[in-house]
């Protein structure tokens, strides 16, 4: 009864729910939920039944395997989907998939909040910016990675002349897409023309 | 939540019909079916019959077929039940229950609260 | 149609007490057993489907066990919400029976 999956798919796409393990032989039922009691569709060894539900049009089920085909996700099919087979024996097994449908990330600006000089050393800060999304910052000076420490939407540091950059790339990423953003300075300290 | 809403008690003379209604929320209407049980004063459960929201399909106790006719309404999510030719013997609670599937498994998983239903002269 | 048979018809029992409810299918039925329980005046409640498996939101002091032609219901530890009227039911084929209920009474 236990079974629980994590997906994680970019908007847009087609997903395929399915389990990793062959269905239970003969069964009697095969039923999809989203939540529970929301039903989307089931097969009863006669034909599939597909409820209204804002899935309808967009689903299709493979009694064969049980998979589930979904197309065109949005974030809003963000839920804990289930499937539940009925077998001839009347015991039940269930299997729970949990579906996260991300956005593909925007491209980020890089806002440069302060840059000065200072007895040869450079005082950088720089800030990433994208609109309000849940995603990972990667700065990197001239493609090396910053320190794991300075990795968050804002980039505070202060630079010496053996470790100058002359552009800084901010990259902004969650589990489906990544996209960067670069400044370039011309040394010692001022921001390049672009 | 799910919920299944029975309609109110009825008095009935010998031979006339009754129409009970079992309105249900919280779920996929079509995507059950809808069992009924009655209950005699005293007495234990006996299954009447089952009726799929999905298309209609229904399957009745032998001892009432002919006199019962089960049907649904799924642009309000409500189950009918209606018994002919009553009986004194047909007083009893009259319940709905959701079975989990739409085609019948037989499993009820939600009951409605019952309606009492006397058959008096 | 097959017949299901609850022993003891009544049970006296305390709080705290393990209190077991036999069920006998007149033909075997596999795993395709529920069990329900009623309070006076109020509509049944499932507890148990397919011989084993709890309902949503039933405390996991009720446990149901069994195949074929032999079911058990248990109640390890009985709670004074508990004392009540407890029905197996088969669902392997039309028409669906009842067993005729076992009462939980306090002792």
């Known amino acids: 009864q236990g079974h629980l999956v994590h997906m994680t798919v970019v908007s847009g796409s087609n997903v395929t729910l399915n389990i990793s393990e062959s269905l239970p032989e003969n069964y009697k039922q095969l039923t999809w939920f989203y939540t529970f009691d929301q039903k989307i569709v089931e097969w009863d060894s006669r034909k599939s039944k597909y409820f209204e539900s804002k899935f309808k049009g967009r689903v299709r089920l493979d009694p064969q395997s049980g998979a589930l085909y979904i197309s065109k996700v949005q974030k809003e099919d963000n839920s804990t989907y289930i499937m539940r087979v009925l077998k001839k024996t009347g015991n039940e097994q269930e299997w729970k998939i949990k579906l996260q449908v991300l956005d593909p990330v925007p491209k980020p600006v890089i806002k440069i909040e302060k840059i000065e000089d200072m007895d040869d050393n450079c005082y950088l800060k720089l800030s990433c910016v994208i609109p309000g999304e849940s995603v990972n910052y990667t700065w990197y000076g001239d493609k090396r990675p910053f320190p794991k420490e300075l990795q968050n939407s804002v980039l505070e540091t202060t630079l010496m002349p053996h470790n100058y950059s002359r552009c800084y790339t901010c990259q902004v990423s969650n589990s489906v897409s990544s996209k960067n953003g670069t400044v370039c300075l011309s040394p010692p300290c001022t921001l390049a023309r672009s | 939540q799910v919920r299944l809403v029975e309609s109110g008690a009825e008095v009935k003379k010998p031979g006339a019909s009754v129409k009970v209604s079992c309105k249900t929320s919280g779920y996929t209407f079509a995507g059950y079916g809808i069992t009924w049980v009655r209950q005699a004063p005293g007495r234990g459960l006996e299954w009447m019959g089952w009726?799929?929201?999905?298309?209609?399909?229904?399957d009745y106790a032998q001892s009432l077929q002919g006199r019962v006719t089960m049907t649904t309404d799924t642009s309000t999510s409500t189950a009918y039940m209606e018994l002919r030719s009553l009986r004194s013997d047909d007083t009893a609670m009259y319940y709905c229950a959701r079975d989990r599937y739409s085609s019948s498994s037989g499993y009820f998983d939600y009951w409605g609260q019952g309606t009492l239903v006397t058959v008096s002269s | 149609d097959i017949v299901m048979t609850q022993s003891p018809s009544s049970v006296s029992a305390s709080v705290g007490d393990r209190v077991t409810i036999t069920c006998r299918a007149s033909?075997?039925?596999?795993?395709?057993l529920a069990w329900h329980q009623q309070k006076p005046g109020k509509a049944p409640k499932v507890l148990i489907y397919a011989a084993s498996s709890l309902h949503s939101g039933v405390p996991s002091r009720f446990s149901g066990s069994g195949s074929g032609t032999e079911f058990t219901l248990t109640i390890s530890s009985l709670q004074p919400e508990d004392f009540a009227t407890y029905y197996c039911q088969q669902a392997n084929t039309f028409p669906y029976t009842f067993g005729q209920g076992t009462k939980v009474e306090i002792k």
């Open positions: 033909q075997g039925i596999s795993s395709w």
């Open positions: 009726v799929s929201a999905y298309n209609g399909d229904t």
